[in-house]
Interface confidence: low
Amino acid sequence: QSPTPSPTGLTTAKMPSVPLSSDPLPTHTTAFSPASTFERENDFSETTTSLSPDNTSTQVSPDSLDNASAFNTTGVSSVQTPHLPTHADSQTPSAGTDTQTFSGSAANAKLNPTPGSNAISDVPGERSTASTFPTDPVSPLTTTLSLAHHSSAALPARTSNTTITANTSDAYLNASETTTLSPSGSAVISTTTIATTPSKPTCDEKYANITVDYLYNKETKLFTAKLNVNENVECGNNTCTNNEVHNLTECKNASVSISHNSCTAPDKTLILDVPPGVEKFQLHDCTQVEKADTTICLKWKNIETFTCDTQNITYRFQCGNMIFDNKEIKLENLEPEHEYKCDSEILYNNHKFTNASKIIKTDFGSPGEPQIIFCRSEAAHQGVITWNPPQRSFHNFTLCYIKETEKDCLNLDKNLIKYDLQNLKPYTKYVLSLHAYIIAKVQRNGSAAMCHFTTKSAPPSQVWNMTVSMTSDNSMHVKCRPPRDRNGPHERYHLEVEAGNTLVRNESHKNCDFRVKDLQYSTDYTFKAYFHNGDYPGEPFILHHSTSYNSK
């Protein structure tokens, strides 16, 4: 089943998938527990940058950029994407403990979610389902096979034998060759016609490009090295049986002298650079919780120390049809609440020695924006807002209302579609914002919908600090301070002057400053001052004052 394509070229493999590379995984290791949907840890990765399919340059940590003594010169490029960096670009040896710094880029592309099952092995070293890496170009099988320099390509298991015929032109053999690929993936070469048989090659030359697979035993914590050769070779000191070297300790070099009756001295001295133990690596989710709805970050962690040169370790990830040669990857612009599958493997000196598969479900995304149907003022102290909820999952609403610089917010039940606002201030503009939120790994707020209304008018409050003072025998000066709450559109001060029950003056000013002249001498007056806002009068402030007996 082919991977599901996506608009931007990044896909997620449907199950079952195929091996990450052609290197066969260890099959005589202990069983693993099945994978469950990967639970994220609250861990942060600080050094991730954006991974784009167009980014052709992979940054390499130069610190292995260092002791060159163990460097493997084989360049490896991706079969699917020719511009992806080679292994040689992303790995170099080191005399120290330098490791590869992640400075790749993040896949900034749409990744199709994984359908169906979670039954994927979650433990490095083996998996029940495979991934979609192309044939591993570490040891590519080409159509022209050279016997003298043959390096067997281990291919995925097949149910029937595959025969490849290659005409071989070689310094040592000139023959038409039939190469049979057995289900185990080893190449069996049978010579059909030998044109010439010159002198034998040296074993040193014949096995110059010999490749090795390392198989790890979790019980003994030892490795077995499987020599990828087509005949049963002999090893000095009888160190191998059936082309396998057993009981190799992690991170220790072992020297094996290889010979065969088809070649002459000098023998090939093979240095086995044994990888670190499989259980010393853990695939860790490094996604920042704030971004867990649309991003996935995966990172291999060294959970135990080992003495292997970390510069010789390379990491490979496949998420969909995108392949990354980094210790850490970051995928961006993903769909919230979707499952994505990533396969990963670790290589030591370009030999795969462990792998893991993760299914990660992205977090709940931010809810959408609610749709406000209407919001208006019903009365001087009340308003109402009604809305339709957003489509996406959410837990509750937050309604905020702002008057001038004051802001009040309240949480509303997710089932509400209407809210009556009480105790509002009359004749005041209220700006309302309504957003849904969801409590996921962090609280995610949706976009806010906005609306506004102005409450109806109401009677203003009383003027205050009213004073009445005599300016002459028959004149008074009345002053007051504005009301605390005007509660309406206009501003007018009124003064009513009564003598007994008779209204003798009624004045209206823009300011509360009245000069009342020509009053009767020696008379008791009642002064009533109030504010009118254009719709309603306020409560009057009342003072009593008497004119004096004329002094003249």
């Epitope: 940054q59 130069p62 003594s69 040689a88 710094t101």
Partner: antibody, heavy 118, light 112 residues
């Protein structure tokens, strides 16, 4: 005493190429990377790239990827840097330096001055 | 690229005095092995640069203990105590954790 001996000063015309050499002695040449560094007159140091003498593997500063080519001759323990399409901007002193995994650039050549002038 | 900014551009010190040179990076460059490959070099007049301190605070064999390096994250310092005449020249910091390797613009140390 580790020694990196560089070729002498060079006066070259614009558009031409120059090949600088760096001969290593008193250590195992293939055990250390060779890095190349540019120092324009009175200016700071700029890293050009490195080569693994054992494998021939190279890595370059993007700025110099089309300008410099690094090679080695293991038989003579010599590293080379070819600078092509020379302009006045390439006038500088170029240093070779060796590097291990733990200790970076612990030995430097004496520098090779390149002057580009018509 | 990791940009390295050195301050001051130059400084003058009396013999026997003490100086500090600051180096600030545009981003953290801790290598994934946990090491910070921040190095200090001295280029004496008319000579090639020479390594003084590697991995922030490790003195190269033969470098006097008057030279000390410190710092973490994006801020690093080279301290020279009991300055001698032989210490004059241009001091460079450089990071070797990320490609491309980058250097500071240099601090010229002069003797009063």
């Amino acid at each position: 005493q580790v020694n990196l001996l560089q070729s002498g000063a060079a006066l070259v015309k614009p558009g031409a190429s120059v090949k600088l050499s760096c001969k290593a002695s008193s250590y195992t040449f293939t055990d250390y990377y060779i890095h190349w560094v540019k120092q324009s007159h009175g200016k700071t140091l700029e890293w050009i790239g490195y080569i693994n003498p054992k494998s021939g593997f190279t890595n370059y500063n993007e700025k110099f990827r089309r300008k410099a080519t690094l090679t080695v001759d293991k038989s003579t323990n010599t590293a080379y840097m070819d600078i092509s399409r020379l302009t006045s901007e390439d006038s500088a002193t170029y240093y070779c330096t060796r590097r291990t995994g733990v200790i970076p650039m612990d030995a430097w050549g004496q520098g090779a001055s390149v002057t580009v002038s018509s | 690229d990791v940009v390295m900014t050195q301050t001051p551009v130059s400084l003058s010190v009396s013999l026997g005095g003490q100086v500090s040179i600051s180096c600030r990076s545009s981003q953290s460059f801790v290598s994934s092995d946990g090491n910070t490959y921040l190095n200090w070099y001295l280029q004496k007049p008319g000579q090639s640069p020479q390594l003084l301190i590697y991995k922030v605070s490790n003195r190269l064999s033969g470098v006097p203990d008057r030279f000390s390096g410190s710092g973490s994250g994006t801020d690093f310092t080279l301290k020279i105590s009991r300055v001698e005449h032989d210490d004059l020249g241009v001091y460079y910091c450089g990071q070797a954790s990320k490609i491309p390797l980058t250097f500071g613009s240099g601090t010229k140390l002069e003797i009063k």
